[in-house]
Structures are given as C-alpha cells and as structure tokens.
C-alpha cells in the first residue's frame, strides 16, 4: 500500500533537534550510513558501511545545513569485524576510531553498550537520515526517528527463513509501514538507554512480514571492548 509523502524513516517522525546526541553521520562526500558514538573516540556502525576513508559527523540534525553544533572528525582507524560475511551479513558490525576526541556536550554524547540482550516487546528508538519512501527514494535532510518494538526471534526467523543468525534480531512491525531504510544502515537501535542494535538489512523497507533486521550488539560487547583496548 502507498504511504504518505510525509512519512519519515519510513513511517516515523522528525526527531527533536539534537535529541539523539549519539547519532552520527558517516560522510564520504555524501551521507551514506549512520553510526553511534560509544565513547569520546569510538563509533559503532555496520560492517557493510566500510569505506577506506570516512568523515564522521557528530552533532548533526540537518545534514545539509551547518547549524553550529556539528563536529566533523576524520576516521583514524576503521575496523570491520574479522568474521564479517558480506553474503550473509553475519557479524555486520564495524568500529571507527576518531582521529581526535569528540567534545562531549548536550548535543554530542555517548550511548551505553548493552548489559543484557534485547527483550521481545521492548520499545526502541531507531534513527537515521535514510530513505523515507517505502518504494522509490526520498531522502530527508533532518534526522528521522521511529519507535518500534523488538520482535521475537521466532517471528524474525519466520520472516526470513534460513537467513537470521544468532547475531541478528528483528525490530519493527509485521504489518509494514514503519521501518528503517537505505541510508539508515549503521545507525542506532536504542532500547532503555542502551545500544542494542545496528541498522543492517531487510527485504525492502516497511514491507508486510519483512521487518528490519539489526545486528545484535550484545553479542559484540567483548569484541568492542577488546578492540578499543588494543587500538588505544
């Protein structure tokens, strides 16, 4: 079914300005992925967002306008998970070390790593500058937000038979209409103040019985901590 032109993310809403202070934009001459600031010098994104040169843009709301709160910092190190599989998208996670520390303030701050796996039914916030159209392409300038629940692993696997690994989980609505989309990859799924997911993949966007699939950050907390320690 067609959705209104003002549907955001797909089916979300305009985030309040700088209300998602951990959200970053990955830029290579254009915005191509999102990410999450997890400490002053490290960002989590998706493995499939890898590029050899990335500028990390923090404090963004409207990515087409300099609003005065931005910090643009080049990536010093880009570390894709060693077991990332581009065919199955298993281990779709990546760490970016910033070439200088971010200045933490009200508009740029970090998000906590998870202390437990995501629980079914938990309401989460997904954000990004991705496509807002479920068919075709319409890219917003301002950050979009979507509140969506964690789906059970059984429903997730039923939606994508044989494709869901233990490192993935689904968030969204089986009825369709609300979802992350192209341009949201690498961005955050935050549940109860913890970074539970990284936007990864899906069959289209906002399609019925095809919810968004996200990297389960909980499974990578040890890798994240070890990698940061080894590269500090």
């Amino acid at each position: 079914a067609p959705f209104d032109d003002d549907d955001k993310i797909v089916g979300g809403y305009n985030c309040e300005e700088n209300s998602v202070p951990y959200q970053v934009s990955l830029n290579s001459g254009y915005h191509f992925c999102g990410g999450s600031l997890i400490n002053e010098q490290w960002v989590v994104s998706a493995g499939h967002c890898y590029k050899s040169r990335i500028q990390v843009r923090l404090g963004e709301h409207n990515i087409e306008v300099l609003e005065g709160n931005e910090q643009f910092i080049n990536a010093a190190k880009i570390i894709r998970h060693p077991q990332y599989d581009r065919k199955t998208l298993n281990n779709d996670i990546m760490l970016i070390k910033l070439s200088s520390r971010a200045v933490i303030n009200a508009r740029v701050s970090t998000i906590s790593l998870p202390t437990a796996p995501p629980a079914t039914g938990t309401k989460c916030l997904i954000s990004g500058w991705g496509n807002t159209a479920s068919s075709g392409a319409d890219y917003p300038d301002e950050l979009q937000c979507l509140d969506a629940p964690v789906l059970s692993q059984a429903k997730c696997e039923a939606s994508y038979p044989g494709k869901i690994t233990s490192n993935m989980f689904c968030v969204g609505f089986l009825e369709g209409g609300k979802d992350s989309c192209q341009g949201d990859s690498g961005g955050p799924v935050v549940c109860n103040g913890q970074l539970q997911g990284v936007v990864s993949w899906g069959d289209g966007c906002a399609q019925k019985n095809k919810p968004g699939v996200y990297t389960k950050v909980y499974n990578y907390v040890k890798w994240i901590k070890n990698t940061i320690a080894a590269n500090s």
Epitope: S28, G29, Y30, H31, F32, C33, A46, H48, C49, Y50, K51, S52, R53, R86, L89, G130, A133, S135, G136, A137, D138, Y139, S180, C181, Q182, G183, D184, S185, G186, V199, S200, W201, G202, D203, G204, C205, G212
Partner: antibody
C-alpha cells in the same frame, strides 16, 4: 523491455546551457535511479550524476556547480542541464538506468548502469 | 576522488587467446567495481558487477576478480565479437571509470 531515448539540441553555443531529456519507455521511471554519463569523441566515460524519482540527486563533484538534474514522473522523463558550457563539454551524452540492485542492506551506495540510451551528440560551438 | 588506472590501454590478441585486463583503484573500494564493454558507435554494456558477478545473459567466457584496490577482468577465449573497448568502473564513492582498454584481433 525498458528503453531509453535521449533528446535535445545537437548544437549549443559557448557560455549557454545544455539541456537534454531522457524518455523512459517500456517500464516505470519510479522504481529506479537514473544517470547521465558523457563521452568526448575518442575518449573515456565520465559520470555526470544520478537522480531519484523524488528528485534526490548526487552529482560528480567536478561538475556539481554547473549541473542540474530533474525528473518528471508524469511524462516518464528525466532531464539534464549543464550551464556555462565550453568546447570541453562537446561529447556524446548518455542516459542510463541504475542497476538499483538495492540488495538488502540499508546503506546509500551506487551500483552502476544496466540499461543505456543510444546516446546523443552535443557540440559546443559558436 | 577515486582514480581508476586501467592497463593496458590497448592490446592485440588472437581468436581463442586468454585476455586479461587489470584495473587499480587509488584507494580501497572493497568489491564495488563493474566492467563494461563498448563497441564502436554503441553505448556501453554492463558485463560484470560487484567485481565478479556476471550480468544476466553475458557469456561465461567473461569473468572478473579482485577486491580492495586490484582487479582483473578476463576473457577466457577471445571471440571475434569481443572486439571492443572495456572499461572498469568504481561505485564505492560516487562513480568513476577507468581509461579503457581497446581489444583488437591480431
């Protein structure tokens, strides 16, 4: 089977604006991204830009200041305008459809071109 | 901008020969590389996408390989109809083409 046809003036005066249109037949313009590419005689290919049916555009950074692309979904057409042309803009101009192998990932990326028009020659001369 | 360096710029080979063209990117582009064939007076035709995937309907004598910065395009057994100019194209960051390789029959 989707077909593309470029049209527009074959001769443009220096400093003026080159305007071309690509008409898509045999399929909807709405489900893909669309490109313009050019090729000076005897030389290689140069990508000009990409447009979505929403009007969202990406331009070659070296041409960005002079390029405007637009789309008219009702006519199944998309267009190119290149301002302040010089003799260096003389070329065969192609329109093409993006591979749009969206794949399943949710990043913004480019894919390439799987359907091309036959090209139209534009000469910049007074 | 990402530069694509293609070599050789031209080559001459006999029918049945194995032909290899290389393309080098100025920075890591993962597998985001395509190969096109362009015959005189015609538009380019996509042969291979994402470095190694054969486009539908393209003969299996064409193949591609590589990742990162170094890529190879191969025609396993050159046919008369393969006379054309071949271009690599990176799609990792915007789009740029290599300079082309003109393939002729000896």
């Amino acid at each position: 089977q989707v077909q593309l046809q470029e049209s527009g003036p074959g001769l443009v005066k220096p400093s003026e604006t080159l305007s071309l249109t690509c008409t898509v037949s045999g399929g909807s313009i709405s489900s893909h991204y669309w490109h313009w590419i050019r090729q000076p005689a005897g030389k290689g290919l140069e990508w000009i830009g990409r447009i979505a049916t929403s009007g969202s555009t990406y331009y070659n950074p070296s041409l960005k200041s002079r390029v405007t692309m637009s789309v008219d979904t009702s006519k199944n057409q998309f267009s190119l305008k290149l301002s302040s042309v010089t003799a260096a803009d003389t070329a065969v101009y192609y329109c093409a459809r993006d591979l749009t192998n969206y794949g399943i990932t949710k990043s913004i990326r480019f894919y390439g071109m799987d359907v091309w028009g036959q090209g139209t020659t534009v000469t910049v001369s007074s | 901008d990402i530069q694509m360096t293609q070599s050789p710029s031209s080559l001459s080979a006999s029918v049945g020969d194995r032909v290899t063209i290389t393309c080098q990117a100025s920075q890591d582009i993962s597998n985001y590389l395509n190969w096109y064939q362009q015959k005189p007076g015609k538009a380019p035709k996509l042969l291979i996408y994402d470095a190694s995937n054969l486009e539908t309907g393209v003969p299996s004598r064409f193949s591609g390989s590589g990742s990162g910065t170094d890529f190879t395009f191969t025609i396993s057994s050159l046919q008369p109809e393969d006379i054309a100019t071949y271009y690599c194209q990176q799609v990792d960051n915007f789009i740029t083409f290599g300079g082309g390789t003109k393939v002729e029959i000896k």
